[in-house]
């Protein structure tokens, strides 16, 4: 046993060594030799004991969805899709894996989180990290310059996720994007309107949408004295301001990233500010910031954006926040992020954010990265963080001890006596053919009590009971599970009666 443990330890160590050599880009010969050693060590472990030791689980950062969780998910998706469609979006789908080259250089520091697929001797492939880069690739490949689309699919990130907070390595994204050359800020405002509509419809609590602009950030860094090469890394520090204090962010910028303390202080004066359109106007008057072309453009667009947001009736949900510096490299203009707010402990306190539930922004340069001639297609979009929303909805339903139906069955075809299986089969078939969602128990002679109990557990509202007398009279006994009230319905009227009671349209066109 000790020998096996030692061998397992060596396999682990050798695996780490191989990974390390690959990361260090060691010589192919050395990697090949160390991989061969790893395989020999694994072979010595032998297959039999390792089978017994195999723990049945999903891979790290993934989960199964139970019927109950799926019911929650379907409801959330339904709200989102209805909103996307209401705004005139088409739907597309793209492969779950892309050429590695497609994804490279699009995510900055986050590139290390991309899952590479093991080389199968052909193309170098990676699992998609988001839906935006594949969308840009799709536009460039099909030479599209104009589309409004949504895409709901799983994406993959080699993160160390806190799954309790709704963070995973495989998770859904729900994206809505508008591509095309349009007048400034109209599509951007619609994206923010969609975000607010969805978050309001989901009833997951009060939320705030933080808005900023990449150009304002870049302009601000420039006037504060940050060199171009440090823009992105300082951005990632600033973006932590929603989680940690300014002091900690400053320490990181000065201590770890080599920024001069006075430069950090100048940045601090700006990034700790947040407000509404009045802050935009105040910054337009800022003697230094207003002299920077990029920042001035960004502020001008934000002023216009706030006008449209007011017309859309959502300006009260929006906060101009100079610390918002979303991590992805491809944003070029407006950026935004929706956070849920915890109710403050004391009245008058600042509302406290509990994590991003939606985000997005403008990325005018991404499609051009794929175009041989570098032709740009301006794009703006949003992504709903549905995994976090699923978690919140699930927790809320658990707290309320609310029963969630996991099927849509409208009626159970039951019998009160024995030897009526054939009649039940005939009736259930008639109901299916008429578009009724119906079930029966898979027993020849089920007890009536068991059938009624099944309805209660599954939340099935109606039971169609066949008995010998009913057959003679040409009726079916229709029973309401909750009220226990029973009525005889002529067989030819049964479909219509079930539809009437369950609020289903009478034609299934």
């Amino acid at each position: 046993m000790a020998e096996r443990a030692a061998l397992e330890e060596l396999v682990k160590l050798q695996g780490e060594r191989v990974r390390g050599l690959k990361q260090q880009k060691a010589s192919a010969e050395l990697i090949e030799e160390e991989v061969a050693k790893l395989l020999k060590l694994k072979a010595q472990l032998g297959p039999d004991e390792s089978k017994q030791k195999f723990v049945l689980k999903t891979p790290k950062g993934t989960r199964d969805y139970s019927p109950r969780q799926m019911a929650v998910r379907e409801k959330v998706f339904d709200v989102i899709i209805r909103c996307f469609k209401r705004h005139g979006a088409e739907v597309i789908d793209t492969p779950v894996f892309e050429l590695k080259e497609t994804l490279m250089g699009k995510y900055g520091e986050d590139s290390k989180l991309i899952y590479d697929l093991k080389d199968q001797g052909g193309e170098l492939l990676s699992l998609r990290y988001d839906l935006t880069v594949p969308f840009a690739r799709y536009l460039a490949m099909n030479k599209l310059t104009n589309i409004k689309r949504y895409h709901i699919a799983k994406v993959y990130r080699r993160d160390n996720p806190a799954m309790t907070r709704g963070r995973y390595r495989e998770f859904y994204q729900c994206d809505f994007d508008i591509a095309g050359n349009f007048d400034p800020m109209i599509p951007d405002a619609e994206c923010l309107k969609i975000m607010c509509e969805i978050l309001s419809s989901l009833q997951i609590g009060d939320f705030l949408v933080k808005v900023n602009d990449r150009r304002i950030l870049d302009g601000m860094f420039a006037i504060c004295g940050v060199s171009d090469s440090k823009f992105r890394t300082i951005c990632s520090s600033v973006d932590k301001l929603d989680k940690v204090s300014w002091e900690e962010v400053k320490n990181e910028m000065v201590g770890e990233k080599g920024l001069a303390p006075e430069v950090a202080d100048r940045i601090g004066d700006y990034v700790q500010q947040h407000g509404g359109v009045s802050l935009v106007e105040q910054l337009l008057q800022d003697p230094k910031l207003s002299q920077n072309k990029q920042a001035l453009e960004g502020l001008g667009d934000l002023k216009l954006l706030f006008e449209y947001l007011t017309l859309f009736g959502i300006d009260d949900k929006i906060s101009f926040d100079l610390s918002l510096a979303r991590g992805l490299d491809y944003y070029t203009g407006v950026i935004y992020e929706a956070v849920l707010l915890q109710t403050p402990a004391q009245a008058g306190e600042e509302p406290l954010g509990v994590g991003s539930v939606a985000a997005g922004g403008r990325y005018d340069g991404l499609v051009g990265m794929f175009d041989p001639k570098g032709r740009k297609v301006p794009c703006v979009g949003l992504s709903i963080g549905v995994e976090r929303i699923f978690s919140i909805v699930e927790q809320r339903l658990e707290a309320l001890e609310e029963k969630i139906r996991t099927t849509e069955t409208q009626v159970l075809v039951a019998s009160a006596q024995k030897k009526l299986l054939e009649e039940r089969l005939k009736l259930v078939s008639e109901l299916w053919d008429a578009g009724i969602k119906a079930e029966l128990l898979y027993k020849k002679n089920p007890k009536l009590l068991n059938q009624l109990q099944y309805c209660e557990e599954a939340g099935i509202p109606l039971v169609a009971i066949i008995g010998e007398q009913e057959l003679k009279d040409g009726v079916i006994k229709l029973r309401s599970v909750t009220s226990r009230e029973e009525v005889d319905v002529r067989r030819e009227d049964l479909v219509e009666e079930i539809k009437r009671r369950t609020g289903q349209p009478l034609c299934i066109c």
């Epitope: 061998l7 330890e9 060594r17 061969a36 060590l41």
Partner: antibody, heavy 120, light 107 residues
């Protein structure tokens, strides 16, 4: 029984050559990486060279690179070290050893050693 | 090359004593470390590999610990046959190197 036995050591003049052999028995020789390790009189241990079970991988300490050649004959369960252009500092007891768990660069089975003396 | 430094270079102890020998690597070697015992005129004998795994047939009074750059070999209760020279060796990267040795003598 499981053992390694070295031979071929002796007195040789600087610039001379010598071929050491190591006979293995009691285990599947071809499965194992094998190595030569030496120890100068009254001194510590020094890794000289290794060879994989399939002959595919070999490596040498910088001090002996270009002068020593490691080889093996799996059919004869034998390991060899061809030493050319010998120097005074090559004087040592030469041990052959087997890698632990076939591929881990730690000697779990050693021969008794063979003394090589380089002197004019 | 990775340098291995053992301390002390010699230690005197009595039967029944607990003895600890330390080995430091000039750079991180994870757990790729072995300990050997060598008696005069004999080949080294493997005691510990992978920093803490006891080689089959080695008495349990020998134990190893550590990872990264700092490692120790402990003999919990010295026996007469334990008086010898002890070497550590890194197996992280070629050339695999040994410590200079620690001579354990009878007090």
């Amino acid at each position: 029984q499981v053992q390694l036995v070295e031979s071929g050591g002796g007195l040789v003049k600087p610039g001379g050559s010598l071929r050491l052999s190591c006979a293995a028995s009691g285990f599947t020789f071809s499965d194992y990486y094998m190595t030569w390790i030496r120890q100068a009189p009254g001194k510590g241990l020094e890794w000289v060279s290794y060879i994989s079970g399939s002959f595919r991988y070999t490596n040498y300490a910088d001090k002996v690179k270009g002068r020593f050649t490691i080889s093996r004959d799996n059919a004869k369960n034998s390991l060899y070290l061809q030493m050319n252009s010998l120097r005074d500092e090559d004087t040592a007891v030469y041990f052959c050893a087997r890698y632990v768990y076939q591929v881990v660069a730690i000697g779990d089975l050693w021969g008794q050693g063979t003394l090589v003396t380089v002197s004019s | 090359d990775i340098q291995m430094t053992q301390s002390p270079s010699s230690v005197s102890a009595s039967v029944g004593d607990r003895v600890t020998i330390t080995c430091r690597a000039s750079q991180g070697i994870s757990s790729w470390l072995a300990w050997y015992q060598q008696k005069p005129g004999r080949a080294p004998k493997l005691l510990i590999f992978a920093a803490s795994s006891l080689q089959s047939g080695v008495p349990s009074r020998f134990s190893g610990s550590g990872s990264g750059t700092h490692f120790t070999l402990t003999i919990s209760s010295l026996q007469p046959e334990d008086f010898a020279t002890y070497y550590c060796q890194q197996a992280e990267s070629f050339p695999y190197t040994f410590g200079q040795g620690t001579k354990l003598e009878i007090k």
